[in-house]
Amino acid sequence: QPDAINAPVTCCYNFTNRKISVQRLASYRRITSSKCPKEAVIFKTIVAKEICADPKQKWVQDSMDHLDKQTQTPKT
């Protein structure tokens, strides 16, 4: 889980080792702060859980692409 030591900087120290179904993901944000030990992606699920993931993994990239497309699609 993400850890906010000195708010407002949130860092990830461990990544999930399981894929999260894209149907469960609501949004994401990238962690690129130099105050953090590693770059990360934090996914927020539909039940508001936050999960740290490795941006180098393909499933993470696919999930971000999927969420980006969802955001671009206008609601009918």
């Epitope: 999930t16 080792n17 894929k19 999260i20 179904s21 149907q23 469960r24 609501a26 949004s27 539909i46």
Partner: antibody, heavy 119, light 113 residues
Framework: QVQLVQSGAEVKKPGASVKVSCKVS????????MHWVRQAPGKGLEWMGG????????IYAQKFQGRVTMTEDTSTHTAYMELSSLRSEDTAVYYC????????????WGQGTLVTVSS | DIVMTQSPDSLAVSLGERATINCKSS????????????LAWYQQKPGQPPKLLIY???TRESGVPDRFSGSGSGTDFTLTISSLQAADVAVYYC?????????FGQGTKLEIK
Amino acid sequence: QVQLVQSGAEVKKPGASVKVSCKVSGYTLTELSMHWVRQAPGKGLEWMGGFDPEDDETIYAQKFQGRVTMTEDTSTHTAYMELSSLRSEDTAVYYCATHDFWSAYFYYWGQGTLVTVSS
Amino acid sequence: DIVMTQSPDSLAVSLGERATINCKSSQSVLYGSNNKSYLAWYQQKPGQPPKLLIYWASTRESGVPDRFSGSGSGTDFTLTISSLQAADVAVYYCQQHYSTPCSFGQGTKLEIK
């Protein structure tokens, strides 16, 4: 395409334990979230538990807490469900079920394993 | 925990007629941001594992005949078979996958009248 192949039928005495296996092919086990669902004769589907990647842990239905253990052997791509202190009401078909990365529903099911508890 | 309740428990319908099964959840399974309800319908025939028919309350799984349709949102859902075929005799279950633990309805047995 995920395939789930379960171990064969078992007959157990009350008080004993049973361990049912579910071998995964087509995906690696760590890419999936394996769940177990049982069905007593003539009854409905009952979720027993499964791996929740959002909490990074195995979650068990309250009814089975302390009596069920779900484990994985990643080297053989096999998931296991062990139920202890068996009683006659545990006679049921036990299914493993999972979904792939693009889904959140149980699209893939094992063929089922009949466990009969009888003295 | 979310409790799923189906009605009726059993249903007898003539071939070619419409069959309607209802499912109610004790809490909403709708995620407002994507306006999707995390509700699935399964069909189970004797001696077989369940088969996914519909997800997100109304999206038909590929290969499922279009006589099957799902509707509803939030807490109230319906599975409709527009023209019953002999192959549709089975038990039907709804399931929520919005929150853990996931839960199934008790099932509705569909028979031919």
